[in-house]
Interface confidence: medium
């Protein structure tokens, strides 16, 4: 997180840490973690942790490790021979089904999914919270959770920023309605290592709750504007995937 500040896991209890690759995710119920497809495409058996503000290895040993049962990548995500050259991050969303249910508590609890009503349509200027252990201004990786509050911006703002290390012509980068552009204020942004974490917005119908409006996906340059997977467009796929892959007990 660039331009952010120290955060406590108690304020982001849905935050999941992936250690390979170094990334994030969001707990959405006791059996399921939501993340970005690009986080899990290269590792279908990710090790995840919840409930710890610090990801120093000695601290992780004391936090709750989650074991995956299966990874479900959105069918619209294009799997590439050489993922390093990716210019299309459309449908950057995945679900991880857990082997065992997560025990909830003050440092571990799920984030809501967006509702289907127009109340959950984001407007430019709407504020969301991002969190993660990715690159900061001072560190390649954060040991302690960082967070920032940033506004939704028009997609063109993201298009206007020059890609820092283009793997193709600027025109090759794909921008779709499945993406949210956010940031641009005081250099606050998500960055390498924050991928898959939630862009959390206050629930318009219950101010005590947050919902995952977006997932950290990609960006032209850290510290400018970032692109987030628009979770609202995938609620049907999320619900269907969870229903088809749940045990009778969960239903």
């Amino acid at each position: 997180i660039i331009g952010g500040s120290d955060a406590d896991i108690k304020n982001f209890p849905w935050q999941v840490f992936f250690d390979n690759p170094w990334a994030g995710g969001a707990l959405i119920n006791e059996y399921w973690v939501l993340t970005a497809a690009h986080v899990v495409e290269g590792n279908r058996e990710p090790t995840m942790y919840v409930g710890s503000t610090s990801v120093q290895t000695s601290r992780l040993a004391k936090s709750k490790m989650l074991t995956p049962e299966h990874v479900f990548i959105h069918p619209g995500w294009k799997l590439l021979e050489v993922p390093e050259g990716r210019t299309n991050f459309d449908n950057d969303i995945a679900l991880v089904r857990l082997k065992d249910p997560v025990k909830m508590g003050p440092t571990v609890s799920p984030i809501c999914l967006p509702g289907t009503s127009s109340d959950y349509n984001l407007m430019d200027g709407d504020l969301g919270l991002i969190s993660g252990w990715g690159r900061t201004e001072k560190r390649d990786r954060a040991v302690r959770l960082k967070a920032a509050r940033l506004p939704v911006a028009p997609l063109r703002k993201c298009k206007e920023v020059k890609v820092e290390k283009p793997t193709a012509d600027a025109e090759a980068y794909v921008f779709t309605p499945n993406m949210i552009c956010a940031g641009g204020e005081k250099g606050m942004d998500s960055c390498k290592g924050d991928s898959g974490g939630a862009f959390a917005v206050q629930d318009p119908n219950d101010k005590t709750k947050f919902y995952a409006a977006g997932l950290v996906s990609w960006g032209p340059q850290c510290g400018t504007y970032g692109l987030y997977t628009r979770v609202k467009n995938y609620v049907d796929w999320i619900m269907k995937t969870m229903q088809e892959n749940s045990t009778p007990r969960e239903d």
Epitope: N20, Q56, T57, S58, D140, R144, K192
Partner: antibody, heavy 119, light 111 residues
Framework: QVQLQQSGAELVRPGASVKLSCTAS????????IHWVKQRPEQGLEWIGR????????KYAPKFQDKATMTADTSSNTACLQLNSLTSEDTAVYYC????????????WGQGTLVSVSA | DIVMTQSPDYLAVSLGQRAPISCKAS??????????MNWYQQKPGQPPKLLIY???NLEFGIPTRFSGSGFGTDFPLNIHPVEEEDAATYYC?????????FGGGPKLEIK
């Protein structure tokens, strides 16, 4: 598992340049940071710098700012270190190293490349 | 630059005894409550091997006879009981501030 394979030994003339490579297997270099470390014969370790292969961000130790150039090619999963205007002081073993899942230490190292500068 | 000073320069320790190695940083290497201090072992012809990270955490697979401690500027490494295979050079390294720096690396010999 994670492995870093470095290019073979080099014998070069003073004033010349040399390019060393470090090819990773078992992980994508864009997910990590590649560091380079120098070790002169019978001497200690010196940090040259690091590169983030995802966006080519580099950080050099001041001492190596004009001597070394780090690059990375994510398509071949390879990082390179170029050393220019070589002198006998540059005769050393050069290691590449990565964090792995750690946050600021090196669990993984290449086997090292010996560069010998001699007329 | 943060200067790392290790002592002694050389030590010879009998099998089964304790080998204490000290590392002092010219300024604090702590950040956000953690010490960015790591220890490596190097044998001739081999790359360094991580022993201890963040001052006191034993790397996976490293025997428990190795222990590290300290915070701020003083970081001792202890090997006890010393075994034959521990004959090597030991480097401390700080990664709190660029440029990352290593200590001089005392050589441990087993008597």
């Amino acid at each position: 598992q994670v492995q870093l394979q470095q290019s073979g030994a080099e014998l070069v003339r003073p004033g010349a340049s040399v390019k060393l490579s470090c090819t990773a297997s078992g992980f994508n270099i864009k997910d990590d940071y590649i560091h380079w470390v120098k070790q002169r014969p019978e001497q200690g370790l010196e940090w040259i710098g690091r590169i983030d292969p995802a966006d080519d961000h580099t950080k050099y130790a001041p001492k190596f700012q004009d001597k070394a150039t780090m690059t990375a090619d994510t398509s071949s999963n390879t990082a390179c270190l170029q050393l220019n205007s070589l002198t006998s002081e540059d005769t050393a073993v050069y290691y590449c190293a990565i964090y792995g899942s750690g946050w600021a230490w090196f669990p993984y190292w290449g086997q090292g490349t010996l560069v010998s500068v001699s007329a | 630059d943060i200067v790392m000073t290790q002592s002694p320069d050389y030590l010879a320790v009998s099998l089964g005894q304790r080998a204490p190695i000290s590392c002092k940083a010219s300024q604090s290497v702590d950040y956000d409550g953690d010490s960015y201090m790591n220890w490596y072992q190097q044998k001739p012809g081999q790359p360094p091997k991580l022993l201890i990270y963040a001052a006191s955490n034993l790397e996976f697979g490293i025997p428990t006879r190795f222990s590290g401690s300290g915070f701020g500027t003083d970081f001792p490494l202890n090997i006890h009981p010393v075994e034959e295979e521990d004959a090597a050079t030991y480097y401390c390294q700080q990664s709190n501030e660029d440029p990352w720096t290593f200590g001089g690396g005392p050589k441990l010999e087993i008597k």
